[in-house]
Amino acid sequence: APPDPLSQLPAPQHPKIRLYNAEQVLSWEPVALSNSTRPVVYQVQFKYTDSKWFTADIMSIGVNCTQITATECDFTAASPSAGFPMDFNVTLRLRAELGALHSAWVTMPWFQHYRNVTVGPPENIEVTPGEGSLIIRFSSPFDIADTSTAFFCYYVHYWEKGGIQQVKGPFRSNSISLDNLKPSRVYCLQVQAQLLWNKSNIFRVGHLSNISCYETMADASTELQQ
């Protein structure tokens, strides 16, 4: 086919999709034109496995990513539950436009959020010391609408200060009790989430939370003797 005479703009370079927790953000490097006073604008389109291409606009996906001067498109800007369904196979493409001119489309490799997401650490971690125990409560890295499709489980990495690290899990609950610890000792811990998706037998392991340390309570019988 002869080249399209209107396809004379350079294409956007190095597009990246950021999938962090519930975020879905496409970004790219700007197209720089030395001989134009008008700004270059960009258009983003998406498709699912067997669908046609859709322009990414308010009607189709809830955000406007057509004729934009910004060099990113945040599909989850409206709310964390917005954006593409997390178990869908999504392909994105992007081009630059200037008046009647446009670049070639740059098509990205397909993604599935659950397959490709980077999972952050559990949030809002609270630890309550007990007698020879620590009770740990936290919230999940992000909300999963349908927990029959995918769910989080959790691991606690813990160690007595100066001692050997251990791992406890996997737990389905957002509340974990570390028992059989020594009383009146300092234990350090990190919590880690793991995303399990029922359509795939591959998991996504999350980042570890920051290290935090706590002293278990004294044994009641020991306190009575003092």
Partner: nanobody, 111 residues
Framework: QVQLQESGGGLVQAGGSLRLSCAAS????????MAWYRQAPGKQRELVAT??????WYADSVEGRFTVSRNNAKNTMYLHMNSLKPEDTAVYYC??????NGQGTQVTVSS
């Protein structure tokens, strides 16, 4: 509390196979939830497989090579490791929420 004990590690050539066992002391213990993880010297602990009965999920690095099975009559969970690679060299541990961890079992894969 139920105690876990790993065994079955050893030295094996690249491409070879091993079967690791995770035995639970305690006649009533059933493995409905458990995981295998590994620790190589100087590296972060790495989750290898997670089991929530009846499903198992695997790390990208071992998917298609490692499988998990269990024998409830023997209170034992297994990690079948095929097509082993030098990068699989580590101490392997099993863990379950209601049990104490074991000492791990060393797997060394030579090239």
């Amino acid at each position: 509390q139920v105690q876990l004990q790993e065994s079955g590690g050893g030295l094996v050539q690249a491409g070879g196979s091993l079967r690791l066992s995770c035995a639970a002391s305690g006649s009533t213990f059933t493995f409905s939830t458990m995981a295998w993880y590994r620790q190589a010297p100087g590296k972060q602990r790495e989750l290898v497989a997670t089991f929530f009965s009846p499903s198992t999920w695997y790390a990208d690095s071992v998917e298609g090579r490692f499988t998990v099975s269990r024998n409830n009559a023997k209170n034992t969970m297994y990690l079948h490791m095929n097509s082993l690679k030098p990068e699989d060299t580590a101490v392997y541990y099993c863990t379950s929420p209601s049990a104490s961890n074991g000492q791990g079992t060393q797997v060394t894969v030579s090239s």
